[in-house]
Interface confidence: low
């Protein structure tokens, strides 16, 4: 007859931190040296035995004299309520065919975690619990006095729970968030009426979820050490030593070696000299709550990250070439390096690739003279490209060369009695053509009528003009720029003995915001080009004199520059250049890039005042120095009369008042007789010029009273 195999010696211990019950028992009457498959049913009750909250089965193989263990984790902190546990068993083994029957239940084992001792009337659990963000947590309070009203708050916000018995209320916190690394504050307050009886709080330590390490990668620079790096993601460390920062361990499966990493985002792995080429690394991140791991498999020779090249030098540097040399750290015999050179200079970047063994050399050609360059080099494994090394660079400057272009030269010729005054201008050579620092300009003046006669003027840089007084002969003038190496080609200009073409009429032109669009009739005969020069009409010519060269087949150009200002008049002259380099004035033009309304009104005089008329005149008003071409004048007249005088028409002023207006369309007509007036009458007038942009500024009217018929003025 089979004896019932009843669980005996049931002991229950607790782990408050883990909120777990640990059951320990043995099975009596088991056959010696036999193993049986058994099922144990476990019942757990809370507060009282009849309140069963959990039932479950645990299957295992049981030996004689074996102590069995099983654990259960409670959602509710164990301090919140008494728990009761009992167990029964069933043989579920083929050695014992049916009928199988359950044993009797063991007696209830009471589990009470007494942490509500002392004089306090209120307790909150669990204390200092560590959980992961997003988990569900149950907390409770235990109140000694059931007459007390207890309110609980999570980070200051009231929470509501479920009463388990008159002394205990539980609160389910769903998907708890991470708030701060020093924990989430929860407190409860007991009160009777409006009187506080006491307050208790706990800190719930919510850890951020441990992330899988990202961007895990290993590389070597010397075949001695592998340098592994990763992005650890969020640090899961919590305050008060509740949870340290996650730890990282490297495991290499081929060698079976393991290393605890002492840094949060990198670890060095010693490469043993046993010619292991393939590595299979697992990086394990671990904190108190979970583990995460990532894997990489690679061939060592495919993960070479070289140290940056060194000893970068430049040899045989001249104006247009240089030899760049460098060294690389030798890491293995017969290793081929792929190196990339970057050359930066004059706002440009060139890139070159070269394969080398030990020392690098590259011939840099087609360089600009007198230019500072920055050259840098980086290298990688040519056989299995993984990653470029860091750059190593150095600056060098090419030597100067003779200037490569003639200066751009122009002139202003003014006729004085018996001679020409020639003001010669030149533009500084661009860096591209100067090929170094321009030190001086040589101006050679040669009298074409007396070929043996010539003069040399040496003008130190940075001067860009000079004045020559020449007699009424023809002259050839050469301008040459010089630097420390040599001279530029000469720029040649010829000054004719004949005076400039005086008969050229000046034409008015209208500019735009973009500048001035100019066109002209081609010069008869052969021309080698045209020159357009210009300056501010009102200023000294030398102040802002500019010119532009135009090709021989072009008879129009647009002069656009930021220097053109609204309300400023510019004078343009267009010259043709003959094959003999003699300039002939073809056309003159004048205009504004943008006309403005007149800046002032004329000073008006009242003449010949009679009982029936008066004369207005403003002879002194200059039309030249205005911010636009004066097109004429508006004469405004006010009187008591309802009707406007002949030639005047009704107008409304900006203030809304009515008056009479007369328009003069000739800017040089600077007088007006106002007649048909009544004696002893009161009149007011105001005169303003106008341009295409509008009238001059508004001003006060001037008052005039006509005398009686018998008076004489």
């Amino acid at each position: 007859e089979r004896l019932p195999l009843t669980p005996v010696s049931l002991k229950v211990s607790t782990n408050s931190t883990r909120q777990s019950l640990h059951l320990q028992w043995t099975v009596h009457n088991l056959p010696y040296h036999q193993e049986l498959k058994m099922v144990f049913q476990i019942q757990i009750s809370r507060i009282e035995t009849s309140n069963v909250i959990w039932v479950g089965n645990y299957s295992t193989t049981v030996k004689w004299n074996q102590v069995l263990h099983w654990s259960w984790e409670s959602e509710l902190p164990l301090e919140c309520a008494t728990h009761f546990v009992r167990i029964k068993s069933l043989v579920d083994d083929a050695k014992f065919p049916e009928p199988n029957f359950w044993s009797n239940w063991s007696s209830w084992e009471e589990v009470s975690v007494q942490d509500s001792t002392g004089q306090d009337i209120l307790f909150v659990f669990p204390k200092d619990k560590l959980v992961e963000e997003g988990t569900n947590v149950t907390i409770c309070y235990v109140s000694r006095n059931i007459q007390n009203n207890v309110s609980c708050y999570l980070e200051g916000k009231q929470i509501h729970g479920e009463q388990l018995d008159p002394h205990v209320t539980a609160f389910n916190l769903n998907s708890v968030p991470f708030i701060r690394n020093k924990g989430t504050n929860i407190y409860c307050e007991a009160s009777q009426g409006n009187v506080s009886e006491g307050m208790k709080g706990i800190v719930l330590f919510v850890s951020k979820v441990l992330e899988e390490p990202k961007d895990f990668s290993c590389e070597t620079e010397d075949f001695k050490t592998l340098h592994c790096t990763w992005d650890p993601g969020t640090d899961t460390a919590l305050g008060w030593s509740k949870q340290p920062s996650q730890s990282y361990t490297l495991f290499e499966s081929f060698s079976g070696e393991k290393k605890l990493c002492t840094h949060k985002n990198w670890c060095n792995w010693q490469i043993t000299q046993d010619s292991q080429e393939t590595y299979n690394f697992t990086l394990i991140a671990e904190n108190y709550l979970r583990k995460r791991s990532v894997n990489i498999l690679f061939n060592l020779t495919h993960r070479v990250y070289l140290m940056n090249p060194f000893s970068v030098n430049f040899e045989n540097v001249n104006a247009t070439n240089a030899i760049m040399t460098w060294k690389v750290h030798s890491i293995r015999n017969n290793f081929t390096y792929l190196c990339q050179i970057e050359l930066h200079g004059e706002g440009k970047m060139m890139q070159y690739n070269v394969s080398i063994k030990v020392n690098g050399e590259y011939f840099l050609s087609e360089l600009e003279p007198a230019t500072e360059y920055m050259a840098r080099v980086r290298c990688a494994d040519a056989s299995h490209f993984w990653k470029w090394s860091e750059w190593s660079g150095q600056n060098f400057t090419t030597l100067e060369a003779a200037p490569s272009e003639a200066p751009d030269v122009w002139r202003i010729v003014s006729l004085e009695p018996g001679n020409h005054t020639v003001t010669l201008f030149w533009k500084p050579l661009s860096k591209l053509h100067a090929n170094g620092k321009i030190l001086f300009y040589n101006v050679v003046v040669e009298n074409l009528d007396k070929p043996s006669s010539s003069e040399l003027h040496s003008i130190p840089a940075p001067a860009n003009s000079t004045k020559l007084i020449l007699d009424r002969c023809s002259y050839q003038i050469c301008v040459i720029a010089n630097n420390s190496v040599g001279a530029s080609p000469a720029s040649v200009i010829v000054i004719s003995a004949d005076p400039e073409n005086k008969e050229v009429e000046e034409e008015r032109i209208a500019g735009t915001e973009g500048g001035f669009s100019l066109s002209w009739k081609p010069q008869p005969g052969d021309v080698i080009g045209y020159v357009v020069d210009w300056c501010d009409h009102t200023q000294d010519v030398l102040g802002d004199f500019q010119w532009k060269n135009v090709g021989p087949n072009t008879t129009s150009t647009v002069i656009s520059t930021d220097a053109f200002r609204p309300g400023v008049r510019y004078d343009f002259r267009i010259y043709g250049l003959s094959t003999k380099r003699i300039a002939c004035l073809l056309e003159k033009k004048t205009g504004y890039s943008q006309e403005l309304a007149p800046s002032d009104n004329p000073h008006v005089l009242v003449d010949t005042l009679t009982s029936h008329s008066f004369t207005l005149s403003w002879k002194d008003y200059s039309t030249e120095s205005q911010p636009g071409f004066i097109q004429g004048y508006h004469v405004y007249l006010k009187s008591k009369a309802r009707q406007c005088h002949p030639r005047f028409e009704k107008a409304v002023l900006s203030d809304g008042s009515e008056c009479c207006k007369y328009k003069i369309d000739n800017p040089e007509e600077k007088a007006l007789i106002v007649d048909n007036l009544k004696p002893e009458s009161f009149y007011e007038f105001f005169i303003t010029p106008f341009t295409s942009a509008g009238e001059g500024p508004s001003a006060t009217f001037t008052k005039v009273t006509t005398p009686d018929e018998h008076s004489s003025m």
Epitope: N181, D235, L238, G239, P244, S247, L260, T262, H263
Partner: antibody, heavy 120, light 107 residues
């Protein structure tokens, strides 16, 4: 080179306070945990307190808990130990030590120590 | 707290000897165990960390082994400069604890 220099030690009466400082140089201070370890005359080593690289984890020996406070200022490369309610048994040579990692692993660099004497 | 017990407390040996010092933890500390050497009037020096990893610059005659609760420090061939006091230390849990020390003297 890597160096730790302690200061702030001296003679103090029981119940009074003292603040120790440790100036670090030659390494990236905020990449490592730091410790205070003491040695009473003729005795062995006793760990006093430790602080992780970002101050997220702090630990104390039971004998000093509630009286001593460890802190660090990464911007100043400095470690501190505020000692309150000093007792005669706190008399010792106090070492500042650098950990090999960001948490508590092992102490690879030590200062020369500063002496604290608690006596009436 | 994890109690660390070193044995022997003191030890006499000669230059060239092989010496072993043991350290026992009151509970498992995994491999979170370090060994230090201290000479009179000097600060301690880290010899071995993680039970068996030799600290950079430490001679290879020093070695460590063990895991869990039992650990050993071995000096394969004593040199004159090795006579000092040796401490084990666990960093498995706080508070960190040291052994009471083993004094190694010249015989």
């Amino acid at each position: 080179q890597v160096q730790l220099v302690e200061s702030g030690g001296g003679l103090v009466q029981p119940g009074r306070s003292l603040r120790l400082s440790c100036a670090a140089s030659g390494f990236t201070f905020d990449d490592y945990a730091m410790h205070w370890v003491r040695q009473a005359p003729g005795k062995g080593l006793e760990w006093v307190s430790g602080i992780s690289w970002n101050s997220g984890s702090i630990g104390y020996a039971d004998s000093v808990k509630g009286r001593f406070t460890i802190s660090r200022d990464n911007a100043k490369n400095s470690l501190y130990l505020q000692m309150n309610s000093l007792r005669a048994e706190d008399t010792a040579l106090y070492y500042c030590a650098k950990d090999i990692g960001v948490y508590y692993y092992g102490m690879d660099v030590w200062g020369q120590g500063t002496t604290v004497t608690v006596s009436s | 707290d994890v109690q660390m017990t070193q044995s022997p407390s003191s030890l006499s040996a000669s230059v060239g000897d092989r010496v072993t010092i043991t350290c026992r933890a009151g509970q498992s500390v995994g491999t979170y165990l370090n060994w230090y050497q201290q000479k009179p009037g000097k600060a301690p020096k880290l010899l071995i960390y993680a039970a068996s990893t030799l600290q950079s610059g430490v001679p290879s005659r020093f070695s460590g082994s063990g895991s869990g609760t039992d650990f050993t420090l071995t000096i394969s061939s004593l040199q004159p400069e090795d006579f000092a006091t040796y401490y084990c230390q666990q960093s498995y849990s706080t508070p960190i604890t040291f052994g009471q020390g083993t004094r190694l003297e010249i015989k």
